[in-house]
Amino acid sequence: RCRAGTQPLDSYKPGVDCAPCPPGHFSPGDNQACKPWTNCTLAGKHTLQPASNSSDAICEDRDPPATQPQETQGPPARPITVQPTEAWPRTSQGPSTRPVEVPGGRA
């Protein structure tokens, strides 16, 4: 099976050849096609956890409930100035973050 950060090149023989996700995409593995990262900033939310080649970003509301302590808010939104992600026209162009080199190959 294709591991995290990679996707099958051939849907008929999943796990035989696995290529890394393209930039800005992620795959949790298990032969899943790469999907675009969510852009928390453009969804009007904080980025609680940045996306990686193997997982999507985790977002949280900018204004947590009044009862929630201030220090539990997420970090400031990252300075991204792009629009929200949309479905990929290719069946699966997929991701990787800047410091990460995505291994290809099989799990």
């Epitope: 290529a19 890394p20 930039p23 995409h25 996306a51 026209p89 069946t91 991701p95 800047r98």
Partner: antibody, heavy 121, light 107 residues
């Protein structure tokens, strides 16, 4: 038709930076990953990295990770590649190249015309 | 990094000849190989992806083959416009890497 038009030739001093642009037309810019590849004189092709305009996510060749910065301006359908701390061995033709439209294959189906960067003191 | 070694580095041939270029990967890359043609002073052009699939508009005299570590690009009947340099590229793993090129010259 689908086209990538790059900025003109540059002559730079060692230690300086260069920023090359690549303006896309004929397709939906944000939906295709844009990559950068360079070719030193008389040499082969070397992949620098790529960026997905829709969310700004980028992937770099580790050989360039600390010196190359890829950005996009979606309002003008333009991709940029900035290379810092230039040295003579960075003298090359720099190409932008769009990733193709056939499934998850990481190949390049449309290329810019190339930008010659000369690093010389 | 995966090394892609092409051979020969150059060859001389005549119009009408059958020409075969080989590319050897330093490790198994499945079928994740593309081939490009480049003419002097011009950008490369995609010919083949997925080892053997011709890109749109590429003449059927160009064919690709192989899997694993050994790949070939064959031009069944060389035409005047085919004199150029040819490169293979692997995309099973980052960084994406290219072969050193094979220059096809007129005999």
């Amino acid at each position: 038709q689908v086209q990538l038009v790059q900025s003109g030739a540059e002559v730079k001093k060692p230690g300086s930076s260069v920023k090359v642009s690549c303006k896309a037309s004929g397709y939906t810019f944000k939906d295709y990953t844009m990559h950068w590849v360079r070719q030193a004189p008389g040499q082969g092709l070397e992949w620098i990295g790529g960026i997905y305009p829709n969310n700004g996510g980028s992937t770099y060749n580790q050989n360039f990770k600390d010196r190359a910065t890829l950005t996009v301006d979606k309002s003008t359908s333009t991709a940029y590649m900035e290379l810092s701390s230039l040295r003579s061995e960075d003298t090359a033709v720099y190409y932008c190249a769009r990733m193709g439209y056939h499934g998850p294959h990481l190949d390049f189906d449309v290329w810019g015309q190339g930008t010659t960067v000369t690093v010389s003191s | 990094d995966i090394q892609m070694t092409q051979s020969p580095s150059s060859l001389s041939a005549s119009v009408g000849d059958r020409v075969t270029i080989t590319c050897k990967a330093s490790q198994d890359v499945g079928a994740a190989v593309a081939w490009y043609q480049q003419k002097p002073g011009k950008a490369p052009k995609l010919l083949i992806y997925w080892a053997s699939t011709r890109h749109t508009g590429v003449p059927d005299r160009f064919s690709g083959g192989g899997s694993g570590t050994d790949f070939t690009l064959t031009i069944s009947s060389l035409q005047p416009e085919d004199f150029a340099t040819y490169y293979c590229q692997q995309y099973i793993n980052y960084p994406l890497t290219f072969g050193g090129g094979t220059k096809v010259e007129i005999k």
